[in-house]
């Protein structure tokens, strides 16, 4: 009778995370009598995975009928595989001993590799909004994938970006990996409706990459342009002055009218109109009673947009010496200035 050998026919086994791994093992002899044990790793720190003789191994099931006469097959199934299960598994024959069984012979080992899908990429932008022509950074993170090889691309509105840096960690061997990438994007005034997309391709995804998106509407601030104009006289001694607030984003905006530097009225943008590019327009008007003023009036439209320092535009109303006599022909010179 030839001495027993432990045969592990599979040098390696590749399993997708969440599935079941089958590890095969055959003994070439019934002699010596004794149980089979499965270990992950070798040496003193090896981890017991299954012991035919005793123990409770809820994730492990035996494939063959261990009690069948002449049985020399000892495969096991390990359920719900995770990347942490990766490693080399050894089938070890023990010889019946007293009081304890004695290790007799080990198989050559089967390397279990786990394919794990990357998590959905999470894209995050800068903490504070930025204005057009500024460069902002976006980060993309995905975790828990294996093997290490992975491809990451950045897009803005379908156009691939080239200015980015990517790291896969850890550098050495690991049960699973993470990817971190930072892309630089130059903002334009038309970016309110723009999207930045991070796309991750991995062998586990069967050619169907995962995508994470960020809307530039959460990143961009488009400051308004102001225009103050005087409208034709509405009634005797009354002038209607309007402040056009154009092309701003986001909507959060407060407007204050000043007459000769004194606050006349403050209002918050409410009934705005939206432009095709996603920015907003708004108009505010002020009715000025010219007869109440002896001297010229400096009207200022002051706008505080999205918590930023106020911008303003002024308009000078020239008041004549005898405004009552001029009636509806009151003259008013329009001299505007943009004050910030």
């Amino acid at each position: 009778e030839e001495e027993l050998q432990v045969i592990q026919p599979d040098k390696s086994v590749l399993v997708a995370a969440g599935e079941t791994a089958t590890l095969r093992c055959t003994a070439t002899s019934l002699i010596p009598v004794g149980p089979i044990q499965w270990f992950r790793g070798a040496g003193p720190g090896r981890e017991l995975i299954y012991n035919q003789k005793e123990g409770h191994f809820p994730r492990v099931t035996t494939v063959s009928d261990l009690t069948k006469r002449n049985n020399m097959d000892f495969p096991i199934r390990i359920g719900n595989i995770t990347p942490a299960d990766a490693g080399t598994y050894y089938c070890v024959k023990f010889r019946k001993g007293s009081p304890d069984d004695v290790e007799f012979k080990s198989g050559a080992g089967t390397e279990l590799s786990v394919r794990a899908k990357p998590s959905a990429p999470v894209v995050s932008g800068p903490a504070a909004r930025a204005t057009p022509q500024h460069t902002v950074s976006f980060t993309c993170e995905s975790h828990g994938f294996s093997p290490r090889d992975i491809t990451l691309k950045w897009f803005k509105n379908g156009n691939e970006l080239s200015d980015f840096q990517t790291n896969v960690d850890p550098v050495g061997e690991s049960v699973s990996y993470s990817i971190h990438s930072t892309a630089k994007v130059v903002l334009t005034r038309e970016d309110v409706h723009s999207q930045v997309i991070c796309e991750v391709a991995h062998v586990t995804l069967q050619g169907d990459p995962l995508r994470g998106t960020a809307n530039l509407s959460e990143t961009i601030r488009v400051p308004p342009t102001l225009e103050v104009t005087q409208q034709p006289v509405r009634a005797e001694n009354q002038v209607n002055v309007t402040c056009q607030v154009r092309k701003f984003y986001p909507q959060r905006l407060q407007l204050t009218w000043l007459e000769n530097g004194n606050v006349s009225r403050t209002e918050t943008a409410s009934t705005v109109t939206e432009n095709k590019d996603g920015t907003y327009n708004w108009m505010s008007w002020l009715l000025v009673n010219v007869s109440a003023h002896r001297d010229d009036v400096k009207l200022t439209c002051q706008v505080e947009h999205d918590g930023q320092p106020a911008v303003s535009k002024s308009h000078d109303l020239k008041v004549s010496a005898h405004p009552k006599e001029q009636g509806s022909n009151t003259a008013a010179e329009n001299t505007g200035s943009n004050e910030r």
């Epitope: 009598v33 012991n51 035919q52 003789k53 069948k68 006469r69």
Partner: antibody
């Protein structure tokens, strides 16, 4: 350490039944066959039957097929052998034994249970 | 059914001497490359103890003065140098089919 602990001695009248228990410890009960063997006073060993606790598959010696029933309770790792229609020549020590190699052999034995059948 | 016949029924051997017990099967017990014969030792008041499995393999903890041999139908248990603690009844058992035992051989010291 494998241990098989058997129930205590029994005295039965002819025609009665006896149920002997064998509680296993130190190993996974469902992975190994349990054999039952008896030995009449001053006589040799006589194999009765065997059971696989994993699925209750049984094999009986033809002599005992109609009178013996083997069962197991996997929740308590206990094997049972019931013998019916007892006769005086059933007086014997009844052993349970575990087959560690699935060779239909008897590697570990209980201490035995003496069953006396007497009117 | 396979019948096992042991010989002799009893045997007296001097301490330090060789003891030989035979077991003959009514038909071959060889199958799948193995001889399905087992030897047990039973001392008074104790359960039997497995000595040899598959004809020639010593069980764990069995002194190497015990050996088994044979093939097919004829098998032998040999104690190379009898010790006082070897006094017992020895049984062969087959498992080529369902198990049966030989009638036993009583070994005593001469």
């Amino acid at each position: 350490q494998v241990q098989l602990v058997q129930s205590g001695a029994e005295v039965k009248k002819p025609g009665a039944s006896v149920k002997v228990s064998c509680k296993a410890s130190g190993y996974t009960f469902t992975n190994y066959w349990i054999n039952w063997v008896r030995q009449a006073p001053g006589q040799g060993l006589e194999w009765i039957a065997m059971i696989d606790p994993s699925d209750s598959e049984t094999h009986y010696n033809q002599i005992f097929k109609d009178r013996a029933t083997l069962t197991t309770d996997t929740s308590t790792s206990t094997a049972y052998m019931e013998l019916r229609s007892l006769r005086s020549d059933d007086t014997a020590v009844y052993y349970c034994a575990m087959d560690y190699g699935s060779l239909y052999a008897m590697d570990y034995w209980g201490r035995g249970t003496l069953v006396t059948v007497s009117s | 059914d396979i019948v096992l016949t042991q010989s002799p029924d009893s045997l007296a051997v001097s301490l330090g001497e060789r003891a030989t017990i035979n077991c003959r099967a009514s038909q071959s017990v060889r199958s799948s490359g193995y001889n399905w014969i087992f030897w047990y030792q039973q001392k008074p008041g104790q359960p039997p103890k497995l000595l040899i499995y598959l004809a020639s393999n010593r069980d764990s903890g069995v002194p190497d003065r015990f050996s088994g041999s044979g093939s097919g139908t004829d098998f032998t248990l040999t104690i190379s140098s009898l010790q006082a603690e070897d006094v017992a009844v020895y049984y062969c058992q087959h498992s080529r089919e369902l198990p049966t035992f030989g009638q036993g051989t009583k070994l005593e010291i001469k």
